[in-house]
């Protein structure tokens, strides 16, 4: 008999981790005698239903170092259905684990700290019902370095008063370096904290006053977060308690003794002014978060930044005046003292014009690399000002109202009415794409010297004057504008160094042969989601410009619904990756031979995505006319019911083939051809119920095979032959396997179990009825002990 996975119903992962997450367990599992429990150092039981922990639950895991019991019995307010749950922990439950270093009991209805082993280094008690920490709570935990106890008294996990940390309760924890007590309704910083503390996080409490005695003796502090204690509720994304006073009250000497402080968070504190004495003595301060305050006036004349010569990051975002956008903004001269500043965030301050005077004090800062100015209602911007900044690498002007190149006109008045914040800026970075080589589909601009993000503005046309003096720009994002012009090779003339251009989500008309040819160094061009012009009946589109872009390596024409009246062939010797997903090749390739050679002229193409192209068939001649250089071909989410597998020999270098989300019903029609270099094949989310014997056996390089979410009732060694032992990934989850006793697939899957992800829990039975939806290990199918199952055989 094959050996069952050692830690059923859980899964053994690398580095001594047993993963028991999301298994609906009601008790801590007892592993079989065959399981080598002494090698297990980490056990994760997240999101189960364990409401009672017994003294004996962990005695067999004496070498455990990490235990995660998060989300087993959540407090009422945090439970999805608001069920009440109280977790019972017997007194000696955790004492059996003498080497335990990390324990997470968060999101459980416990009201007291259980007895814990003295070996503990890291303890999480967040989102529980523990409301008191006194000297007895953590007595004897001399090794404890990290304590998280957030969210034990707030709107999602309410309590009648507040969490109470008695004075000196933690003083015995002489090695404690990290303490987090956020969202606990605290009205004061607990007194007599251990002087070893380096990180103290008390944000989103009700601490509206802070003085030196609140932080007395905490001279080792490196990070202090006191944000969100006196909130500006007009910018709150969650229930917000109005601060009972106009701002957080900070004693001038509150931080004077914290000479090691590197990070200070004073966000969402209703601050209207900055007192330069707050920052005196903070010689090592490198990160300062002053976001979500009322510092719109202060930043124009403050001298508080005068001595912050080591500050690297400064966040001033959302320091707007309620219902007002300013005509202009001028930073105070003291910004010029921030000689180490690398990143300045000024989004959401709401000012309408950006010119040379706006940021003048920053122009001399040698280290400044990142400037965030998004969501400011800027409608007039002199982009050339960034030429003067010596080290600038990234400027974000997205989500503004810039509509084109315009000389600034004198604008009078402070405000223009009640513009409010409607959205949070999303992360606009494109998702990484899986490729066999090191060439990602969309190059990451973070490695380039200068990026300008103008996405989500009001641009209708692009004029070269906009980019005067920006010849050093290497990456330009113009996605989500309203650009509807026919680009002809004159729009981007000044940008002679541009390598990446993102024009996705516009309405570009691609007609001119010389489009983008003014960009001699262009390597990546994103023209996805420009579908409107392609939908105009009777209007032709010309892709001949691609051939003229000699350095272009990455091109996206995705999601344009390209279906007819376009160039018959794309040509390029430089192009390596083409995303053509979300178009209508199914329609194009149905037009006789007209578009049969559409991709053939891309002689160096390695990566081609033809997903979502409404393909019902893929004829061998179509594959024959794809570039021979292809290594990755994606055909996801089409309507392919058949595939002529022998035709893969037309693609001699193909390593990855993705056919997920099609309508394949069987893997027949011959087999994968001998000599194929295919390394990864994904046919998940089809309707495959049959695989011909030997189908995969000739593909000697095949290492990763995804057969998940199909209609397979078995998995057979005969499909693979000797190849089976070489597989690194064989995903057969979400198939309706027929779990009869003596099922052949059982021995095979046990033989290759190291390659089968989620084997203990995600590989399930579809039949017989009593086992439907259960793990294939719910009963030992190797032994015919169950009459019903035997009968099924």
């Amino acid at each position: 008999l094959g050996t069952l996975p050692a830690f059923l119903p859980c899964e053994l992962k690398p580095h001594g981790l047993v993963d028991c997450n999301w298994l609906f367990l009601k008790s801590v599992p007892r592993f079989s005698a065959a399981a080598s429990c002494s090698n297990i150092t980490r056990l994760s039981l997240i999101s189960n239903r364990i409401h009672h922990l017994h003294n004996s639950d962990f005695v067999h895991l004496s070498n455990l170092r990490q235990l995660n019991l998060k989300w087993n019995c959540p407090p009422t307010g945090l439970s999805p259905l608001h069920f009440s749950c109280h977790m019972t922990i017997e007194p000696r439950t955790f004492l059996a684990m003498r080497t335990l270093e990390e324990l997470n009991l968060s999101y459980n209805g416990i009201t007291t700290v259980p007895r814990l082993p003295s070996s503990l280094v890291n303890l999480s008690l967040s989102h529980t019902n523990i409301l008191v920490l006194d000297a007895n709570s953590l007595a004897g935990l001399y090794s404890l370095r990290v304590l998280f106890m957030d969210g034990n008294c707030y709107y999602k996990n309410p309590c009648t008063g507040a969490v109470k940390v008695t004075p000196g309760a933690l003083l015995g924890l002489s090695n404690l370096t990290h303490l987090s007590l956020k969202y606990n309704n605290l009205t004061k910083v607990p007194r007599q904290l251990p002087p070893s503390l380096e990180y103290l996080l008390v944000s989103y409490n009700l601490i509206v006053k802070l003085g030196p005695e609140d932080l007395a003796n905490l001279t080792s502090l490196r990070v202090l977060d006191v944000g969100g204690n006196c909130r500006r509720c007009d910018h709150a994304p969650n229930p917000c308690i109005e601060c009972g006073q106009k701002s957080l009250h900070l004693h001038p000497e509150t931080f004077h003794h914290l000479s090691h402080l590197e990070g200070l968070v004073l966000k969402d504190s209703s601050l209207h002014t900055l007192n330069s004495s707050w920052f005196q003595g903070l010689v090592n301060l490198s990160v300062l978060d002053l976001s979500e305050n009322f510092l719109y006036e202060s930043i124009t004349h403050t001298n508080a930044f005068q001595n912050l010569t080591r500050l690297r990051k400064l966040n001033l975002s959302f320091n707007y005046r309620k219902k007002v956008s300013f005509a202009r903004l001028h930073l105070a001269p003291s910004f010029g003292s921030l000689v180490a500043l690398k990143e300045l965030d000024m989004h959401g301050i709401f000012f309408r014009s950006l010119d040379e005077t706006t940021l003048r004090p920053l122009a001399r800062l040698p280290m400044l690399q990142t400037l965030r100015l998004q969501m400011n209602f800027i409608n007039q911007a002199q982009l050339g000002i960034f030429r003067a900044f010596p080290g600038l690498r990234y400027v974000d002007l997205s989500d503004n109202r810039i509509s084109g190149a315009s000389e600034l006109t004198a604008t009078m008045g402070e405000a223009d009415g009640g513009e409010k914040v409607w959205l949070q800026p999303g992360d606009l970075a494109p998702a990484p794409v899986d490729t066999p080589s090191s060439e990602d589909f969309r190059p990451n601009c973070s490695t380039l010297n200068f990026t300008l993000d103008l996405s989500r503005n009001n641009l209708v046309t692009v004029q070269p004057e906009m980019f005067a003096q920006l010849s050093h720009l290497q990456c330009l994002r113009l996605s989500h504008n309203c650009i509807s012009q026919a680009v002809n090779g004159s729009q981007f003339l000044p940008l002679t160094g541009l390598q990446v251009l993102d024009l996705s989500h516009n309405k570009l008309d691609l007609y001119h042969e010389h489009s983008f040819t003014e960009l001699p160094r262009l390597e990546a061009l994103d023209l996805s989601y420009n579908s409107q012009p392609f939908g105009m009946q009777g209007v032709g589109h010309n892709f001949s410009f691609v051939a003229h872009l000699r350095t272009l390596r990455h091109l996206s024409l995705a999601h344009n619904n390209i279906h007819s009246q376009v160039s018959q062939q794309l040509c390029s010797t430089s192009l390596r990756a083409l995303d053509f997903s979300g178009n209508a090749l199914g329609h194009m390739w149905a037009e006789g031979d007209l578009y049969l050679h559409f991709f053939q002229g891309l002689s160096g193409l390695i990566w081609l995505d033809l997903s979502q192209n409404r393909l019902h068939t893929l004829l061998p001649q179509t594959l024959r006319n794809l570039p021979k250089s292809l290594q990755v071909l994606r055909l996801r989410d089409n309507y392919l019911a058949f595939f002529k597998w022998w035709s893969l020999h037309f693609l001699p270098k193909l390593e990855v083939l993705d056919l997920a989300g099609n309508q394949l019903k069987a893997l027949t029609n011959g087999s994968l051809p001998a000599g194929t270099r295919l390394r990864r094949l994904d046919v998940s989310c089809n309707s495959i119920s049959f695989v011909a014997p030997g189908f995969f056996s000739k593909a000697k390089e095949l290492r990763e095979l995804n057969l998940s979410a199909n209609a397979l009732k078995t998995v057979d060694h005969s499909w693979f032959g000797p190849l089976a032992s070489a597989l690194q990934i064989l995903d057969v989850s979400a198939n309706p396997l027929h779990c009869a006793c003596g099922a052949a697939f059982m021995d095979f899957l046990l033989e290759v179990q190291a390659a089968v992800p989620g084997l203990p829990s995600r590989v399930k039975c579809g039949s017989p009825g009593q086992l439907q939806g259960l793990s294939i290990f719910a009963q030992d199918l190797r032994l015919c002990l169950d009459e019903a199952l035997s009968w099924d055989c």
């Epitope: 008695t166 007194r191 006073q245 106009k246 701002s247 009250h249 004693h251």
Partner: antibody
Framework: QVHLQQSGPDLVKPGASVQMSCKTS????????LHWVRQRPGQGLEWIGW????????KYNDQFRGRTTLTADKSSSTAYMFLSSLTSEDSAIYFC?????????WGQGTTLTVSS | DIQMTQSPSSLSASLGGKVTITCKAS??????IAWYQHKPGKGPRLLIH???TLQPGIPSRFSGSGSGRDYSLSISNLEPEDIATYYC????????FGGGTKLEIK
């Protein structure tokens, strides 16, 4: 040395209003709380409320809310207490005191007599 | 609101002797208590804060102790200038004074 100088004694009629002052010196007025405390004849001390001159925030003892207004003039570093609808019960010595947490410096007191 | 019960309301002691005044809070005040000496015609004078921290310039004959709800002020080696009324003040949640203790010398 920190100094709090209060205005002189006052005699007012019932129903009238009064404003008393507390002029501070030798510390940064806007950085600390300024409290007012009452002591009726033969009685103990009662906290009335505070003002934080830095931003003008105020907090009052429920017993005094409504008839009492605390203000501060940053330019002269002076705090004021305005009492309205006075009765004989308001006859007392009124102290101002500076604090961050606890009251560390006090004025000498202003005696208010409410009598017809 | 937190109430402070101070006792005794008055006491008489001999010069050179020792007295103890107590304050009981209606709830745990986490050591946020201060003690004041008040003489007629003057403003009160801070003696002790945070239950036991002696204010600079105050003689070491004065000491404070306690935790939770119960706190005390002790004056040893009594001197004539100690004749005054003594008040406790809680500053854990807003501010409340005790009723005062009038100290006389026998």
């Amino acid at each position: 040395q920190v100094h709090l100088q209060q205005s002189g004694p006052d005699l007012v009629k019932p129903g009238a209003s009064v404003q008393m002052s507390c002029k501070t010196s030798d510390y940064t007025f806007t950085n600390y709380y300024l409290h007012w405390v009452r002591q009726r004849p033969g009685q103990g001390l009662e906290w009335i409320g505070w003002i934080y001159p830095g931003d003008g925030s105020t907090k009052y003892n429920d017993q005094f809310r409504g008839r009492t207004t605390l203000t501060a003039d940053k330019s002269s570093s002076t705090a004021y207490m305005f009492l309205s609808s006075l009765t004989s019960e308001d006859s007392a010595i009124y102290f101002c005191a500076k604090s961050w947490d606890y009251f560390d410096y006090w004025g000498q007191g202003t005696t208010l007599t409410v009598s017809s | 609101d937190i109430q402070m019960t101070q006792s005794p309301s008055s006491l008489s002691a001999s010069l050179g002797g020792k007295v103890t005044i107590t304050c009981k809070a209606s709830q745990d005040i986490d050591n946020y208590i201060a003690w004041y000496q008040h003489k007629p015609g003057k403003g009160p004078r801070l003696l002790i804060h945070y239950a036991s921290t002696l204010q600079p310039g105050i003689p070491s004959r004065f000491s404070g102790s306690g935790s939770g709800r119960d706190y005390s002020l002790s004056i040893s080696n009594l001197e004539p200038e100690d004749i005054a009324t003594y008040y406790c003040l809680q500053y854990d949640d807003l501010y409340t004074f005790g009723g005062g203790t009038k100290l006389e010398i026998k």
